[in-house]
Interface confidence: medium
Amino acid sequence: KKVVLGKKGDTVELTCTASQKKSIQFHWKNSNQIKILGNQGSFLTKGPSKLNDRADSRRSLWDQGNFPLIIKNLKIEDSDTYICEVEDQKEEVQLLVFGLTANSDTHLLQGQSLTLTLESPPGSSPSVQCRSPRGKNIQGGKTLSVSQLELQDSGTWTCTVLQNQKKVEFKIDIVVLAFQKASSIVYKKEGEQVEFSFPLAFTVEKLTGSGELWWQAERASSSKSWITFDLKNKEVSVKRVTQDPKLQMGKKLPLHLTLPQALPQYAGSGNLTLALEAKTGKLHQEVNLVVMRATQLQKNLTCEVWGPTSPKLMLSLKLENKEAKVSKREKAVWVLNPEAGMWQCLLSDSGQVLLESNIKVLPTWSTPVQP
């Protein structure tokens, strides 16, 4: 007996061939001997089966001795043995219909779990293997689960169902809802305007939800809500904003915040959360602000940074075009009695300069100028 695998909602064509290359009488029946369809001369006749409105043949092939049964919009319960009766002989075809669905929405938050459920006919024992967009393979039986979805899991999942050495392939599009970056860091000199951007890693027709930026300043004992906002059809509207600092927010995506001035008291780290309508859980992005200040007080030239710096970052003070006078893995460095000239304060990571502030030291009879 021939086995044909089908996909729920798809179309299948079961073949039946007579030895005579001409239109002769044929009938398709199911395993209960209920007639599905057949012919009467050049007419297509249908029986009382439950397939009635979904079954068809290809009359253009009858005069070639081919009498296919086409079943549209397949259902799991269409799985059966189908019998073609032609020329006093019977051809049997076993049809097995499978369905594969994501048990929840196909739009999932980063960190959530994806469960794929296989619908299969009774008596079948299929195996399933799925390949994620990043090439990870998972295997299972009736259900497959992937916990802790990551951004790279967004895309088309290809699942192969194997039964009787035959296979059928399903493709499921999964969208992982997340920010493009889990964390970002902004380095600014004191007084500069600060731009925070929170680009999303997905696009959807309509995006509605609400969000909030909580900020933990390095100098503060507790965190504080800096801004709350609503998102309606990709339009951003601010609900509440603190007076200090007075943040500004862009009205369109990507989410964009502007801090008018980088000040030492603002240095620290924030957590932007976004709750999307009809989704349990929230999207998170961490953002860090590092602020640098270079000052000269009497005979002391000082450079300081505030905010979350890693221990491997180097802070240096050097006279322009000269070797560094002082270079330390600390958050403050200074030079006593600095020579006159343009001094540079540099925050660097493995030789790469992250932040630079220049200060002009005048001869001792003048006052210092900060460009």
């Epitope: 021939k2 044909v4 695998l5 089908g6 996909k7 798809d10 179309t11 299948v12 064509e13 079961l14 073949t15 039946c16 061939t17 009467q40 050049s42 007419f43 297509l44 006749t45 249908k46 068809d56 290809r58 009359r59 253009s60 092939l61 005069d63 070639q64 081919n66 296919p68 086409i70 035959k166 059928v168 392939e169 493709k171």
Partner: antibody, heavy 117, light 113 residues
Framework: QVQLVQSGAEVKKPGSSVKVSCKAS????????ISWVRQAPGQGLEWMGI????????TYAHKFQGRVTITADESTSTAYMELSSLRSEDTAVYYC??????????WGQGTLVTVSS | DIVMTQSPDSLAVSLGERATINCKSS????????????LAWYQQKPGQPPKLLIY???TRESGVPDRFSGSGSGTDFTLTISSLQAEDVAVYYC?????????FGPGTKVDIK
């Protein structure tokens, strides 16, 4: 979602054969019939034949009977059309198409076969 | 073989105007058992494969704009473009799938006036 991708253009000598492939992706290849249709330069469409991969059942237009062979390889989701005893009037774009009860809802991009001495 | 003929060979219509293409089969393609006409319409643009527009004489393929409609029964069929757009410039073919071999009409070229 289903796509049919055909092999590249061919230049053949009269009397030789050509074999064009048509690879399906994104659907259940075996469950649909594949028809082959050709189109001579500046001309209309001409149906050549059909195969149902799951049963290997084929039907050919009388005009091509004996000269055309349509086959399918389920393992690679690929259908093939081989035309032998080529003559200059076989110069055409050859298309494979998914055949849904006689009409063609998805087409390959076409393969130009040029027969020239 | 069932022979398909189309008229006119070509037509030029102003943008936004109606375009009508006729197709005639040498024998009826209507099945009395399911009351379906085994006729399809295709659109073909230069350098592209044909695209299915209509099947069963009047059923629009999904994704096809509703300005395209098919009508007729038995041996006489019509494809109508209710309001011609620039992107509708193409050759249109009818095809019968009632009998083997499947056959196409010679095509009708539609241009903008």
């Amino acid at each position: 979602q289903v796509q049919l991708v055909q092999s590249g253009a061919e230049v053949k000598k009269p009397g030789s054969s050509v074999k064009v492939s048509c690879k399906a992706s994104g659907g259940t290849f075996s469950n649909y019939a594949i028809s082959w249709v050709r189109q001579a330069p500046g001309q209309g469409l001409e149906w050549m034949g059909i195969i149902t991969p799951s049963g290997g059942s084929t039907t050919y237009a009388h005009k091509f009977q004996g000269r055309v062979t349509i086959t399918a390889d389920e393992s690679t989701s690929t259908a093939y059309m081989e035309l032998s005893s080529l003559r200059s009037e076989d110069t055409a774009v050859y298309y494979c198409a998914r055949d849904t009860a006689g009409h063609f809802d998805i087409w390959g991009q076409g393969t130009l076969v040029t027969v020239s001495s | 073989d069932i022979v398909m003929t189309q008229s006119p060979d070509s037509l030029a219509v102003s943008l936004g105007e109606r375009a009508t293409i006729n197709c005639k089969s040498s024998q009826s393609v209507l099945s009395s058992s399911n009351n379906k006409n085994y006729l399809a319409w295709y659109q073909q643009k230069p350098g592209q494969p044909p695209k299915l527009l209509i099947y069963w004489a009047s059923t629009r393929e999904s994704g096809v704009p509703d300005r395209f409609s098919g009508s007729g029964s038995g041996t006489d069929f019509t494809l109508t473009i209710s309001s011609l757009q620039a992107e509708d410039v193409a050759v249109y073919y009818c095809q019968q799938y009632y009998g083997s071999p499947l056959t196409f009409g010679p095509g009708t070229k539609v241009d903008i006036k």
